[in-house]
Interface confidence: medium
């Protein structure tokens, strides 16, 4: 029987790719990462690898924006010898590369002592909340390089002195990788430097903000005007950032719990929440603020902050168990994160091998449940949804690229927290 390949394709960031197709991934906040090549393999897996650049034999090699590797000037196509940085357009105004400006209305949970600082870098707009220092004068003045007003004479306190300058140095890797994650409270020690471990992280349910932040702390969101004009959605007078979810508030009906809207770039996408047909109890009950009925009983009471029902649904989405195993030997740490699925009945295991903080090896393996049960050292850590797993794998793609070239200490641990669903904000979905 002839094997048909036509049905096999790869899904990567909501795009379908044909077998054999190659592309550069689009990773925020970098944009198109020309130094990574992805290919759709025959078995439907996406394989991404870093481009290895050859040594160039000239004194001043030139970097070209859409090419990964530096070239010698004489090997360049003559037309493109001049490399010009792209300007940005935001809200009808054009900003030059490197220019700083102030934006309004981007962050719905902005504190009174915070302002929104934006910067234009290579055609992309990067915006963040800047916590301003307390003012000790009656007539503060504006300065060109900050959205915060300062007292006359304090003008020297520019970005260079703030914690984690993500605008002056857009190549600061620590500050520039980003993925969505659930809201969780990082341990206080993580905040010591004023910058949380993932300053680029945006909650998909609300901005990850600490109102007690040190002066200059930035939580970054990304607006890439070429592809996405001002990554925010406005619904019912409220502003939502890319990735945020909410239940629509309709004048005639109030909050519609059985519809979940998500801000996708600038477009809101709403979908009906499907409740399970069968419940594991005889009389499931309707609870205010929840779309689906839940089974009453001990379990629900024991988990006050959770939006699970007993069948393992979270906000109407089916949940799956996540297991973890951490194994250390000879200075090498092997961390495995496993997701057990029902359809198909298998376990997807993500294996990370890290030595001295540098990622040595990363691969994904799909194995049968029976084989998985036989593996030692795995502990059930949480249950998660497919949408959270997708966020996790996208973040994983970014940090696997990043951690193979520089030391990563807690990036993977922090990323795993994306999978935890326990604290749904304000107890609703």
């Amino acid at each position: 029987e002839q094997v048909k390949h036509s049905e096999t394709y790869c899904m990567f960031q909501d795009k379908k790719y044909r077998v054999g197709e190659r592309w550069h991934p689009y990773l925020e906040p970098y944009g198109l990462v020309y130094c990574v090549n992805c290919i759709c393999s025959e078995n439907g897996n996406v394989l991404c690898s870093r481009v290895r650049c050859p040594n160039v034999h000239c004194l001043s090699p030139v970097h070209i924006p859409h090419l990964c590797c530096p070239r010698c000037p004489d090997s360049l196509p003559p037309v493109n010898n001049k490399v010009t940085s792209k300007s940005c357009e935001y809200n009808g105004t054009t900003y030059q590369h490197g220019e700083l400006f102030v934006a309004e209305g981007l962050f719905q949970n902005r504190q009174p002592n915070q302002c929104t600082q934006c910067s234009c870098s290579e055609g992309n707009v990067y915006c963040g909340l800047k916590t301003c220092p307390k003012l000790t004068c009656a007539f503060p003045v504006s300065v060109p390089d900050s959205c915060c007003r300062v007292c006359r004479g304090d003008g020297e306190l520019s970005w260079e002195h703030s914690d984690g300058d993500i605008f002056r140095q857009p190549a600061n890797r620590e500050a520039r990788h980003s993925y969505h994650r659930s809201h969780y409270d990082p341990p206080p020690s993580r905040q010591a430097g004023g910058l949380s471990r993932f300053p680029g992280a945006r909650s998909h349910r609300g901005a990850l903000m600490d109102s007690q932040q040190a002066s200059g702390t930035i939580v970054q969101i990304v607006i890439n005007n070429k592809h996405k004009h001002g990554q925010v959605c406005v619904s019912n007078g409220k502003t939502y950032s890319h990735g945020e979810s909410w239940h629509p508030n309709l004048r005639a009906f109030g909050i519609v719990e059985c519809v979940l809207c998500t801000c996708n770039v600038t477009k809101q996408e709403c979908k009906k929440i499907h409740c399970p047909n069968r419940y594991p109890c005889k009389y499931p009950q309707k609870i205010d603020g929840k779309c689906c009925k839940v089974c009453p009983g001990k379990k629900a009471k024991e988990l006050p902050g959770q939006s699970f029902d007993n069948k393992g649904y979270f906000c109407g989405e089916e949940t799956m168990p996540v297991y973890e195993s951490v194994f250390m030997e000879d200075g090498e740490t092997t961390r495995k994160i496993a997701l057990e699925t029902e359809r198909p009945p298998q376990v997807e295991v993500h294996v990370w091998t890290i030595r001295k903080g540098i990622l040595q090896h990363f691969h994904i393996e799909k194995i049968s449940k029976r084989m998985f049960e036989e593996l030692p050292h795995f502990k059930l850590v949480t249950r998660t949804t497919l949408s959270q797993w997708k966020i996790f794998t996208e973040g994983e793609a970014q940090i696997s690229q990043m951690c193979s070239s520089r030391v990563c200490r807690t990036e993977l641990e922090d990323l795993v927290k994306v999978l935890y669903l326990e604290r749904s904000e304000k107890g609703h979905c």
């Epitope: 078995n43 030997e329 298998q346 294996v351 091998t353 691969h363 799909k366 084989m371 030692p376």
Partner: antibody
Framework: EVQLQQSGPELVKPGDSVKISCKAS????????MNWVMQSHGKSLEWIGR????????FYNQKFKGKATLTVDKSSSTVHMELRSLTSEDSAVYYC?????????????WGQGTTLTVSS | DIQMTQSPASLAASVGETVTITCRTS??????LAWYQQKQGKSPQLLIY???SLEDGVPSRFSGSGSGTQYSMKINSMQPEDTATYFC?????????FGSGTKLEIK
Amino acid sequence: EVQLQQSGPELVKPGDSVKISCKASGYSFTGYFMNWVMQSHGKSLEWIGRINPYNGDTFYNQKFKGKATLTVDKSSSTVHMELRSLTSEDSAVYYCAKGAGALRNYFDHWGQGTTLTVSS
Amino acid sequence: DIQMTQSPASLAASVGETVTITCRTSENIYYSLAWYQQKQGKSPQLLIYNANSLEDGVPSRFSGSGSGTQYSMKINSMQPEDTATYFCKQAYDVPFTFGSGTKLEIK
């Protein structure tokens, strides 16, 4: 270079037991499963079981439970397989084979094989 | 246990000819399939894993494909040194099981 050195050929009588060994070198011994595979004369291959050298955990093919016992000696990076209550059916070449990595259940390096002959 | 049906049992090919060996499994193994080559009097050697990934050092004339329960291995241009017995093996579930083998000879 990864090497799996197996012990020499064995000629034993029916009902006896035999212990064959596989000494590993050239890689982190405790980081990879060690598998054992049987190949009867001119026949296909049969997976006997595997051992995790890190902690001695074993998993056997049901067919070989009670027949084979896998053990590990970490100090010498050696895995042993004991076969008991031998019959002529057990005459075969036995291979040890290293697993290809964390959860990759492919055998990327094989020993040279140990020929076992059970005959009275 | 997962059953492996490998075909043909044997075949002879001329140098430069394309050879295809197939393997059918009794249930979906989600690409967890390997192909091994065993030359006369030697140990088996891993050629292909994950149904289509070529092991380091294996000539590019070898390739694997397939999905679900149907898999195949192709030798693009048969060479004299490819004379061997080839086995498929599923690595999806324990116990791991092998195909019965395909003996490939040169014409």
